[in-house]
């Protein structure tokens, strides 16, 4: 014999008090699958948590974090404090990245600058606490007569001095 509750769609529950008919989920509750005997209470996004998606009869509310914080954990169960770019969050709070490391985001850890020489390249732009180094052409490409890097100066007619 088929369970009559299996016919109850998402957004409803199988109401045992009413001969197992399908009743809509009450306000502030939801059921995301069919055949449910109860509806789940909607999550409320309070305090540091802001509503990203409202609860509906078939899906729970989704929260994110107020500015100055970012989500951690499954479904944004926690909000972690942001730091500034060029910092990382340690057990003693936000600390500047050590020399040779950078962080270009408000979260996460400081990462070492790219070692350009490992790729046979030179440093084109130095790194900072907020930005990685920019690697340029290999040192060999920068040697005199390497036309791929510095185009030759246009030939001048004899007797003309530079402008």
């Amino acid at each position: 014999l088929q369970d009559p509750c299996s016919n109850c769609p998402a957004g409803t529950f199988c109401d045992n008090n009413r001969n197992q008919i399908c009743s809509p989920c009450p306000p502030n509750s939801f059921s995301s699958a069919g055949g449910q005997r109860t509806c789940d209470i909607c999550r409320q996004c309070k305090g540091v948590f802001r509503t990203r998606k409202e609860c509906s009869s078939t899906s729970n509310a989704e929260c994110d974090c107020t500015p100055g914080f970012h989500c951690l954990g499954a479904g944004c169960s926690m909000c972690e404090q942001d730091c500034k770019q060029g910092q990382e969050l340690t057990k003693k709070g936000c600390k500047d990245c050590c020399f040779g490391t950078f962080n270009d985001q408000k979260r996460g850890i400081c990462r070492p600058w790219t070692n350009c020489s490992l790729d046979g390249k030179s440093v084109l732009v130095n790194g900072t606490k907020e930005r990685d180094v920019v690697c340029g052409p290999s040192p060999a490409d920068l040697s005199p007569g390497a036309s791929s890097v510095t185009p030759p100066a246009p030939a001048r007619e004899p007797g003309h001095s530079p402008q």
Partner: nanobody, 124 residues
Framework: QVQLVESGGGLVQPGGSLRLSCSAS????????MSWVRQAPGKGLEWVSD????????FYEDSVKGRFTISRDNAKNTLYLQMNSLRAEDTAVYYC?????????????????WGQGTLVTVFP
């Protein structure tokens, strides 16, 4: 071991004020967000307010906004709740609670340590 001890509760008339304190020990107080939660007679737990580790970010339940102020003194390892314009519906046991991760604000289900509570009774 972690200890949270609330004080400052008592009897007060509607419109009156109270200041609750929560003395913390057994952990690096200045690294953790803290909360106040209350439980009215015969009701479930209700989140009241959060404060981040440094004290510069505070958050309140709508019904207490503008009346309650959460603060902390990290040098004294103490959390406070200043309660003004008290109403009968503020009658409850007030608990302070610690958040589980440093520099992080969690939902009430995840608080890892709670005090024993202090009773606030607002009576006409």
């Amino acid at each position: 071991q972690v200890q949270l001890v609330e004080s400052g509760g008592g009897l007060v008339q509607p419109g009156g004020s109270l200041r609750l304190s929560c003395s913390a020990s057994g952990f690096t107080f200045s690294s953790y967000a803290m909360s106040w939660v209350r439980q009215a007679p015969g009701k479930g737990l209700e989140w009241v307010s959060d404060i981040n580790s440094g004290g510069e970010s505070t958050f309140y339940e709508d019904s207490v906004k503008g009346r309650f102020t959460i603060s902390r003194d990290n040098a004294k390892n103490t959390l406070y709740l200043q309660m003004n314009s008290l109403r009968a519906e503020d009658t409850a046991v007030y608990y302070c609670a610690k958040h589980p991760l440093t520099y992080t604000i969690a939902t009430m289900n995840d608080y890892d340590y709670w005090g024993q509570g202090t009773l606030v009774t607002v009576f006409p």
